[in-house]
Structure formats: C-alpha cells, structure tokens
C-alpha cells in the first residue's frame, strides 16, 4: 500500500494522531495515538 | 447512502443577508470539513471558505472575511453559510462540500439571487 | 492564498483529437490537485483527484500528470459527449480552482 503525508489543509484533522493519505484507496485516514480512537482520533479509551 | 441537501432558492434584495443549509445524511458532519464554493451565472467555481464542525473552527477567503460567517449545529448535522451585505455579483449557486476521510462530495446546490 | 493559473481559457478540437489543458500553481501543491467537469446546468463531477488518480466510472481517455507546481490534464481521444468546461483544483493548503477551460467541438 502506497502512503504519503496527508495535504497541509488537513492540519488538525486527527485530533490525537497522524494523518497520513494511503494513495491506493484514494483515502486519508487517521493513525491514532495509544489510547485514541474514532475517524479522527477524537475518543480517549482506557 | 450518503448526501448532502441543500436549503431551496432564495431571493434577496441588496443589503440583505442570505442564510444557506446543508444537512448531512447518512455520516457524521464532526468526521468531516465541510466546504462551501459558489459559481455565478456563466462564470467559474469559487472556494468561499470551510468549517471543522468537530473543532468548530472555520478559514475563509480572504475576499469573503467579515462577511461571511459558516457555523455548523452537530446535534442535526447541518451546516450553514450565511452572506451578509448582498450585492448583485453575490448571485450565484452556493454549494455545501464535504471532505475528510474520502475526497470531496458536492451537494446539489442552491441558487441565491439578488436584486432590487 | 495559492494561486491557480489555467490554461487555455477555451478551445475548440476535431473528433478523435487529444487535448490537454494546464494548471500552474504559484507554489508546489505536492501533488494535491483535482480535476473537474461541468456541463451546463449541472453540478461539477469530479472526473481525477492526486494528480493521476480516477475516479470510479471515468473512462480511461481521462487522464492527469505532474508535479510541483506544473500539472496537465489529457482526453486521448475527445468524444463529443466530453463537450464542457473542466476545472483544476488545488486542495494542499485551503482550495483555490482554476479559471477553467470552455471545450467545444470543430
């Protein structure tokens, strides 16, 4: 799967994690911090 | 299935002010920016600005600062694009874009005209 | 703002021909471009997105290059049902589009 860094306009999606555009699936998509979930990392879990 | 729908047409007299809806159907707005770009009659597409519901933080164009405000209400999952100080050249489609995970989706448009 | 410069405004091709039209940006956009088709009337469609990348349903005579600041969009092969105007979009930093290209038969 081929990826690169998500477009300066999304800056501040991922709340709690890295954005990252996986180039094949035409998606950005949110790699989430230990602890985060959600589309946008938004929900703290324990 | 996801969409996007859009308030009907309005008309408005110069000086008035223009309140446009956008109600997301089928996905959560506070996943996603929603976008809005306006076309006038015969002319080319405009990006007006956009508004992370989740952050609720807006950017807007510079042309369009102080005039435009885009507000979104998460517990309907509407968003809302209002113009003040209408003149003539503010006739146009306005379209709602939504953009985030997936590239963009364009709901069907309003069409705003003003005259006297 | 990044600026978005399209090229030709309009332009008139044969059957069978291929077209190409240009986007230059007034800085790199890292490949962040789309590309857009309006016919009169309708909503745009949204025809290439990541300079290259197409869309679901888009025949394969559309196509999309570049990098940096510089990016053409190609129809191999333009059909008389791709009569409208096509729309570049920069989407790395806020949006700006292009002032479109007007395609007409000969």
């Known amino acids: 799967v081929s990826i690169t860094k998500c477009n300066s306009d999304m800056n501040g999606y991922c709340l709690h994690g890295q954005c990252i555009y996986l180039v094949d699936m035409s998606q950005n998509y949110c790699r989430c911090e230990v602890g985060y979930t959600g589309v946008r990392c938004e929900h703290f879990y324990l | 299935q996801d969409q996007l729908v859009q308030s009907g047409a309005e008309v408005k007299k110069p000086g008035a002010s223009v309140k446009v809806s956008c109600k997301a159907s089928?996905?959560?707005?506070?996943?996603?920016?929603i976008q809005w770009v306006r076309q006038a009659p015969g002319q080319g597409l405009e990006w007006m600005g956009r508004i992370d519901p989740l952050r609720r933080q807006t950017k807007y164009r510079e042309k369009f600062e102080g005039r435009v405000t885009i507000t979104a209400d998460t517990s309907t999952n509407t968003a809302y694009m209002e113009l003040s100080s209408l003149r003539s050249e503010d006739t146009a489609v306005y379209y709602c874009?939504?953009?985030?995970?997936?590239?963009?989706?364009w709901g069907q448009g309003t069409l705003v005209t003003v005259s006297s | 703002d990044i600026q978005m410069t399209q090229s030709p405004s309009s332009l008139s091709a044969s059957v069978g021909d291929r077209v190409t039209i240009t986007c230059k940006a007034s800085?790199?956009?890292?490949?962040?471009i789309a590309w857009y088709q309006q016919k009169p009337g309708q909503a745009p469609r949204l025809l290439i997105q990541y300079t290259s990348t197409l869309q679901p349903g888009v025949p394969s005579r559309f196509s999309g290059s570049g990098s940096g600041t510089d990016y053409t969009f190609t129809i191999s092969s333009l059909q008389p049902e791709d009569i409208a105007t096509y729309y570049c979009l920069q989407y790395d930093n806020l949006r700006t589009f292009g002032g479109g290209t007007k395609v007409e038969i000969k």
């Open positions: 800085q790199d956009i890292h490949k962040y």
């Open positions: 874009v939504r953009s985030g995970r997936e590239f963009d989706y």
């Open positions: 089928g996905f959560n707005i506070k996943d996603t920016y």
